[in-house]
């Protein structure tokens, strides 16, 4: 079958998910497509523990995550509820700043150099993190 029971080569397993950390930069949409071609999605941060894990791997580098408000409200790419979920914005963020002069506001979220989140122009070529969940069937203990 096509069950995912272990992580692909060069992906990092953590808490039953697999993560891939880019070494180059892309616009948010291209990073999103990259992950989707790998049957994954841009990382969705659901806990402080996951935040620290990702932060440890990316270091002090602007890095896209799977959170955007391009269609209005903030949404996680996998459907995780934003309003009730984990958040780690920098103070006074998100601010949908228009002062950058690139047209429009700021609709895509990224980790900043200290790990806290900021919204920025989606066309900026930042690094990114892909995440895919291991199949639930593979998490069950073997029958004795």
């Amino acid at each position: 079958g096509s069950e995912r029971t272990c992580c692909p080569v060069n992906w990092v397993e953590h808490e039953r998910s697999c993560y891939w950390f880019s070494r180059s930069g892309k616009a948010w949409a291209d990073a999103d497509n990259y992950c989707r071609l790998e049957d994954a999605h841009l990382v969705v941060v659901t806990s402080w523990e996951e935040q620290k894990f990702v932060q440890r791997h990316i270091g002090p580098v602007n890095t896209w995550m799977g959170l955007h408000d391009q269609n209005g409200p903030w949404k996680w790419v996998d459907g995780t509820d934003y309003e009730t979920g984990f958040k780690n914005w920098r103070p006074e963020q998100p601010d949908d700043w228009y002062g950058h002069g690139l047209g429009g506001g700021e609709d895509c979220a990224h980790f900043t150099d200290d790990g806290r989140w900021n919204d920025d122009v989606c066309q900026r070529p930042y690094r990114w993190v892909c995440e895919t969940e291991l199949d639930k069937a593979s998490q069950e203990p073997p029958l004795l």
Partner: antibody, heavy 123, light 107 residues
């Protein structure tokens, strides 16, 4: 040994439909994204579509969006391409290609290609 | 879409010659560039990926370089089996566009 074998090409009238198949062997099919690339007679290569390993995500060139559909059956190790509303400019050899990626940078590339199947759209 | 251009469109060369083909992207694609060789009636064959990594089984006379927007494929000493058409392709963003090709033929 990795093998990709396309089939289903032939002569079809404008506006008609055709389904191409690509039978894969020699690798874990469901672990790899696949693509279709075409080449009009005497012309260059044109990427037309891609599908993720599990088949959940698909990508298309604007020239075929809404007319062509890429799909796969991992239980049969087979890639498909449904072509509807065919036009004369769709006449080409169609190749299926297996995607791999550079483990350092992550950049994708097509490491294995089928021999191609010719689709001719003409009245 | 990212546009890819190649130069020259064709090159006439002799066995033993050094041949250099250039590929240019309309925007920065980092090193997300691949080179293929194609002979008449055959499928393309992977030569170089990630701009400079030689595919397993490809002779070491082939080499790739470049990053950003400008890339080069070099054949250090042309062999009879190298007469073919060479294509670059960017895989930085969809659609994965190819260059128009460079035909290497006999002088």
């Amino acid at each position: 040994e990795v093998q990709l074998l396309e089939s289903g090409g032939g002569l079809v009238q404008p506006g008609g439909s055709l389904r191409l198949s690509c039978a894969a062997s020699g690798f874990t099919f469901s672990s790899y994204a696949m693509s279709w690339v075409r080449q009009a007679p005497g012309k260059g290569l044109e990427w037309v579509s891609a599908i993720s390993g599990r088949g959940g995500n698909t990508f298309y060139a604007d020239s075929v969006k809404g007319r062509f559909t890429i799909s796969r059956d991992n239980s049969k190790n087979t890639l498909y391409r449904q072509m509807n509303s065919l036009r004369a400019e769709d006449t080409a050899v169609y190749y299926c290609a297996k995607k791999d990626y550079d483990y350092v940078w992550g950049s994708p590339y097509f490491d294995y290609w089928g021999q191609g199947t010719l689709v001719t759209v003409s009245s | 879409d990212i546009q890819m251009t190649q130069s020259p469109a064709s090159v006439s060369a002799s066995v033993g010659d050094r041949v250099t083909i250039t590929c240019r992207a309309s925007q920065n694609i980092s090193n997300w560039l691949t080179w293929y060789q194609q002979k008449p009636g055959k499928a393309p064959k992977l030569l170089i990926y990630a701009a400079s990594s030689l595919q397993s089984g490809v002779p070491s006379r082939f080499s790739g370089s470049g990053s950003g927007t400008d890339f080069t494929l070099s054949i250090s000493s042309l062999q009879p089996e190298d007469f073919a058409t060479y294509y670059c392709q960017q895989t930085d963003s969809f659609p994965f566009t190819f260059g128009p090709g460079t035909k290497v033929d006999v002088k």
